[in-house]
Interface confidence: low
């Protein structure tokens, strides 16, 4: 199936040019998306090209500027947030990145009624997190690991917590491991729907071992960065959840929400909090051995001023074949009765599907079914449920949006997106206004991305929000590679692959092959999305064939494939890449003497193991910021898939699955190892240990470090990295510079 044919005709060949590395590094062919910032059923905010904040009313067709670019510029604001009563806007400036999601910033409050900044009781700086209440204009913020509350922006703050301490106690914000591996947010506080209560998490990292690394900077002596970071088997953070009445915050103070007994009996995690009503909250907990999750619905007892979580409102989700959930345990979407909910979990056939839970999980009603997976529930209204899945035409790497009518019986299903722009758009997400009156569809490909606005009742397209016309015009004279998405059937396993082929691809010729791998549990690389990136350039200009393969352990094709890697990381992911390469060779157009593999992070681990597999298939390969031993990586992630590194659990496979154990096998390949020295996520330690093992084995290899760079290797390092990797591959494939 050719998804993106190149537009090359003989008459045009002279005017067409190949992609250059410079195109990629300059972001020449990047695309735009349009996500409305919904503020009601029919209104949204959007930052215009000239940086005005504009309010759009879909029904009247009117728009007006609520905040001028002049006001934004006066405090160098890079972000904004309108209070729900529309009286105030916070302006965010001095953005300073911390980890993946977290950052600190300076906040100014602008009063829209008088056109002035609020003076008096200004916010401290820098703030770690700030948000409006869902109704009115209360403010909650986190400063120096403590939570503060303001009833109005000009009021003095009320301090909710007092025990916050850097690297020790975190209130309202996650510590490193919860941010990266559990919550995937910069915040750990949640307003109730009408702003009566504020729930928050407290993380105690007092007993967690610390990772320390040098940050070289410009000073005479390097700084040492210390992060409480639990590696596999280490002591974990202790979490507690509290709720405070924001109307009378001082009276009772924060009330702790009890942990379900079956969870509290051993090490556990808090995984998410969902408000149902102002006086009902749903908490999800997870055992440290992550195959048991408990969803607990708690009610406010006004007479006691406490939160009551009856056992009858505990719902257990357990996996007998792997871990609970996909990458994370799914979160519930509550229906209008405020007790029943919709949730995605595995059905009896081992496919993730939407279920409706009214009383017990055992009595759950299955809403979707089939040999495909429901991926996300976007919105539940009185009469409709909107979700995404990869059902259409049995392509796991697609995403379409569906509507199920839940107001009628039997429920009827309609694919909203399947036939809208079928060639251009096969991978969608959506953003809904209040009550799903309207929604935006964002199509990511395989064609050029496009964002559109739709009527939530009829699904009619109202207007195009962003169609990337400039990008379309810029690509008219570019020889883009061809892309195919197909599958291999091997020993009852389906291996989907994406192949990126040079523009003048000729099946009778031989081409060098580069495998790009990620391969981590519950990931997906073979997706029907648009991209003009480094591998596009390698195909377009350098004439390489690039392939991406989703093997065992990858997502959205059922539990059999997903949980195949449970407790055995580093085995089947590698085997399946190798199997795919052998199949590609059989296709006849691959030069067997010029095959390489590269990957980043988990992909660096898989590429390293593939190079050291002893198959003789790979001439060379690159590992960027690889994991080298699961004992070096974060507890929450690692133990989910590997269990504990203890003798009575899974220590043996922890030891057997290291890159270092295969040092000897790198002797017959060209290996390029790359890592940032300030990687807070996959620590430089991983590559340091690979390098040490290779030196000890007297195996030659190439390496590059990036001083003071983290896991993303951003900025100028990106340019250097891709230039360096390009030279390495061209040398490996004997391609002239």
């Amino acid at each position: 199936i050719v998804l993106r044919p190149s537009r090359v005709h003989n008459s045009e060949e002279n005017t067409m040019r190949a992609l250059t590395l410079k195109d990629i590094l300059n972001g020449t062919f990047s695309y735009k998306t349009f996500f409305p910032n919904w503020i009601s059923g029919q209104e949204y905010l959007h930052q215009s090209a000239d940086n005005n904040i504009v309010l759009y009313n879909i029904e009247t067709g009117q728009s007006y500027t609520i905040l001028s670019n002049r006001t934004m510029k006066s405090v160098n604001a890079s972000n904004y947030g309108l209070s729900p009563d529309r009286q105030f806007v916070y302006l965010e400036s001095d953005y300073s990145k911390l980890w993946r999601y977290s950052y600190t910033a300076t906040y100014y409050i602008y009063d829209l009624s008088n056109g002035e900044f609020v003076r008096g009781n200004e916010l401290p700086r820098p703030i770690q997190y700030l948000c409006w209440s869902p109704v009115g204009s209360k403010l909650a913020y986190v400063y120096q690991n403590n939570i503060y509350l303001k009833q109005r922006p000009g009021d003095p703050p009320f301090q909710i917590t007092f025990n916050g301490r850097e690297n020790k106690i975190f209130n309202g914000i996650p510590d490193w491991v919860y941010e990266e591996e559990m919550l995937a947010t910069k915040y750990a506080l949640w307003w109730s729907p009408n702003g009566k209560f504020l729930a928050y998490a407290e993380f105690n990292d007092t007993d967690i071992p610390v990772i320390a690394y040098s940050y070289y900077g410009d000073e005479q002596y390097p700084r040492t960065i210390n992060i409480p970071y639990p590696k596999a088997g280490a002591k974990n953070p202790v979490v507690r959840i509290f709720i405070i009445d924001t109307t009378y915050p001082a009276y009772v103070g924060p009330q702790e929400v009890p942990v379900p007994a079956m969870i509290a009996s051993s090490d556990y995690y808090f995984s998410w909090l969902t408000w149902v009503t102002d006086e009902r909250v749903c908490l999800q907990w997870l055992k440290r051995v992550q195959n048991v999750s408990v969803l607990s619905i708690c009610d406010f007892r006004e007479d006691w001023q406490t939160w009551d979580c009856p056992k009858t409102q505990e719902h257990i989700e357990e996996s007998r074949t792997g871990w609970a959930g996909g990458f994370f345990v799914s979160t519930p979407v509550f229906s209008y009765d405020a007790i029943s909910y919709y949730k995605i979990f595995s059905d009896k056939d081992g496919y993730k599907h939407i279920h409706y839970i009214k009383d017990t999980v055992e009595n759950a009603i299955q809403i979707t079914s089939g040999k495909w997976e429901a991926i996300n529930i976007f919105r539940v209204t009185q009469d409709s449920l909107f979700y995404s899945s990869n059902e259409f035409e049995e392509y796991p790497g697609r995403r379409n949006i569906y509507r199920i009518s839940i107001g009628s019986y039997p429920p009827s299903k309609k694919c909203v997106t399947c036939h809208l722009r079928k060639e251009r758009c096969q991978y969608y997400t959506a953003s809904f206004s209040d009550y799903a009156k309207y929604y935006a569809l964002v199509c990511y490909g395989p064609g050029i991305p496009i964002s559109t606005l739709h009527d939530g009742r009829t699904d009619q397209e109202i207007k195009i929000l962003e169609e990337n016309k400039e990008l379309e015009n810029a690509l008219k004279n570019i020889q883009l590679p061809k892309e195919e998405i197909k599958k291999l059937e091997v020993d009852e396993i389906t291996l989907w692959y994406k192949m990126i082929l040079p523009p003048q691809f000729d099946r009778s010729k031989k081409y060098p092959l580069l495998i790009q791998v990620y391969g981590g549990p519950c990931s997906q690389s073979v997706r029907s999305v648009f991209a003009v990136n480094w591998i596009s350039y390698l195909a377009s200009k350098e004439g390489m064939v690039i392939a991406l393969v989703d093997g065992r352990g990858t997502a959205f094709q059922g539990d059999k494939l997903l949980y195949a890697v449970y407790r055995k990381l580093g085995v089947y992911e590698v085997e399946d890449q190798i199997t795919a390469v052998r199949k590609f060779i059989e296709m006849g157009f691959i030069d067997e003497k010029r095959i390489a593999i590269w990957g980043w992070s988990y992909g660096g681990y898989v590429s390293s193991l593939a190079l050291a597999s002893g198959t003789g298939l790979f001439k060379c390969g690159i590992a960027v910021a690889p994991v080298s031993s699961w004992e070096y990586y974060a507890s929450v992630y690692t133990e989910r898939f590997m269990g504990l590194p203890t003798k009575d659990d899974n220590l043996e496979h922890y030891k057997n699955s290291t890159v270092m154990a295969r040092a000897e096998y790198f002797r017959n390949v060209d290996y390029l190892l790359i890592h940032g020295t300030a990687d807070d996520n996959v620590h430089f330690q991983n590559s340091a240990q690979i390098a040490k093992a290779l030196v000890n084995a007297q195996v030659d290899f190439q390496a590059m470090w990036y001083s003071d760079q983290n896991h993303g290797l951003s900025g100028l390092s990106t340019n250097h990295l891709y230039t360096h990797m390009t030279h390495f591959l061209k040398q490996c494939f004997s391609l002239s510079d």
Epitope: G253, D303, T306
Partner: nanobody
Framework: QVQLQESGGGLVRVGGSLRLSCAVS????????MGWYRQAPGKRREWVAT???????NYADSVKARFTISRDNAKNTVYLQMDSLKPEDTAVYYC?????????WGQGTQVTVSS
């Protein structure tokens, strides 16, 4: 219906001490958080201190480190130990749940601090 009866007030010199009691009767559940409140002449009633069923305590900034709230669940009684009294502590003191969800307030007990 819950009945509240405050006692223990009186006239005291600056720096002196008093111990207030609040007897709770009727359909009272000891899991309620209880609080002390006060109202000075010509002013609005303000919150003073809270004690939860688990005996966690909270105090208004103006009384921190001088007043101590306690409770005896067996006797359904809440106490307020007032030390280092100041003239600005002069008020009628009341008890109620915290927040004050009981509709019927007691008569209160007068505390007067003279210099």
């Amino acid at each position: 219906q819950v009945q509240l009866q405050e006692s223990g007030g009186g006239l005291v010199r600056v720096g002196g001490s008093l111990r207030l009691s609040c007897a709770v009767s009727g359909s009272f559940d000891s899991r309620n958080s209880m609080g002390w409140y006060r109202q000075a002449p010509g002013k609005r009633r303000e919150w003073v201190a809270t004690i939860t069923s688990g005996s966690r305590t909270n105090y208004a900034d103006s009384v921190k480190a001088r007043f101590t709230i306690s409770r005896d669940n067996a006797k359904n009684t809440v106490y307020l130990q007032m030390d280092s009294l100041k003239p600005e502590d002069t008020a009628v003191y009341y008890c109620n749940a915290a927040p004050p969800i009981f509709n019927s307030w007691g008569q209160g007990t007068q505390v007067t601090v003279s210099s």
